[in-house]
């Protein structure tokens, strides 16, 4: 599996962000493809759970990430995306997104890098 | 296969109400987010309305932001809008779409008259 | 909200030719772009997602490229069942926003 992401991304505090990512594979996408989201803190903390797809989206039950985000990927088009809402300045840190999809399970990890600022600083602000 | 069927246009006077919905079958409805997007009588497609999996947040233009409401229920595969305050401005063909506009339903014609 | 630019509005072609449409966005959209067929009293469909990537059944003469505010969609040799209205859009930010539509005629 390949992984294509942003790689880095500026959003500003208390608005809502698309972490994107998007994966190509050599075998078709069918119920067997998974996503994991997970999350590095900038403090270098311990890595955290964000998301889960598998057929369903899985939303973490607890933890920072409890009610703010929600999948926003289409298999069909080979997007992993998720929603990350009401952006704090303690969500400052790596996403990675893996992408399995049996029998293509191998492949990079794509990363993100998110910078919540105060105010838009230029037009690398991605909305929605 | 996908299916998308919209049903609850009509007629409604200026500063009236009315309440669309949009069956979905052929795919795990819960798993996408939605949206509504209306085409006016002069062909010019317009987003109106988008709904994320999960919790349900929503998202609208600054044009009907306040008058319209979008909601699901995943147990019925069902999407919902609600229009009030309606305007002739709103006169248009409605239609429901899977997540950002993969597939699209044939649509509901609302028209806004006195 | 971003405005996308769409060129030309009308196209009168032959069966055989190859046509160009171009959508111009007022700020960038990376490659949030998506083109959009409408036939005679019918919905749109989706043919081109990600600027690049053709989606689920289309056929390879439509193609799209592009990035950051310069985009084009190619139908490299039309077909009289390719009459039909063609929609660029941006999902880069919230309005999504839509270009004025090319209606595309055969002689």
């Known amino acids: 599996v390949e992984i294509y992401t942003s790689r880095v991304l500026e959003a500003v505090n208390g608005t809502d962000a698309r972490l994107k990512c998007t994966f190509s594979s050599f075998a078709p996408v069918g119920d067997a493809l998974t996503v994991t989201w997970n999350f590095r803190p900038l403090d270098g903390g311990p890595e955290q759970f964000v998301f889960y797809y598998h057929i369903d989206p899985f939303q973490p039950m607890s933890g920072r990430f409890k009610d703010r985000v929600s999948w926003d990927g289409n298999p069909e088009r080979y997007d992993a995306s998720i929603l990350l809402w009401k952006l704090q300045f303690d969500d400052n840190g790596t996403y990675t997104c893996q992408v399995k999809n049996p029998p293509d399970v191998d492949g990079v990890i794509g990363e993100i890098r998110l910078s919540v600022v105060h105010t838009v600083r230029f037009s690398e602000i991605h909305f929605l | 296969e996908v299916k998308l069927v919209e049903s609850g246009g009509g007629l409604v006077q200026p500063g009236g109400s009315l309440k669309l919905s949009c069956a979905a079958s052929?795919?795990?409805?819960?798993?996408?987010?939605m949206s509504w997007v209306r085409q006016t009588p002069e062909k010019r497609l317009e987003w109106v309305a988008y709904?994320?999996?999960?919790?349900?947040?929503?998202y609208y233009p600054d044009t009907v932001k306040g008058r319209f409401t979008i909601s699901r229920d995943n147990a019925k595969n069902t999407l919902y809008l609600q229009m009030s305050s309606l305007k002739s401005e709103d006169t248009a063909m409605y239609y429901c779409?899977?997540?950002?506009?993969?597939?699209w339903g044939q649509g509901t014609s609302v028209t806004v008259s006195s | 909200s971003i405005v996308m630019t769409q060129t030309p509005k009308f196209l009168l072609v032959s069966a055989g030719d190859r046509v160009t449409i171009t959508c111009k966005a007022s700020?960038?959209?990376?490659?949030?772009v998506a083109w959009y067929q409408q036939k005679p009293g019918q919905s749109p469909k989706l043919l081109i997602y990600?600027?690049?990537n053709r989606f689920t059944g289309v056929p390879d003469r439509f193609t799209g490229s592009g990035y950051g505010t310069d985009f084009t969609f190619t139908i490299s040799t039309v077909q009289a069942e390719d009459l039909a209205v063609y929609f660029c859009?941006?999902?880069?930010?919230?309005?999504?926003?839509f270009g004025g539509g090319t209606k595309l005629e055969i002689k």
């Open positions: 779409a899977r997540h950002r506009g993969d597939y």
């Open positions: 052929g795919f795990t409805f819960s798993s996408y987010t």
């Open positions: 709904i994320t999996t999960g919790a349900g947040r929503t």
């Open positions: 700020q960038s959209v990376s490659n949030d």
């Open positions: 990600y600027a690049s």
């Open positions: 859009q941006q999902d880069y930010s919230s309005p999504w926003t």
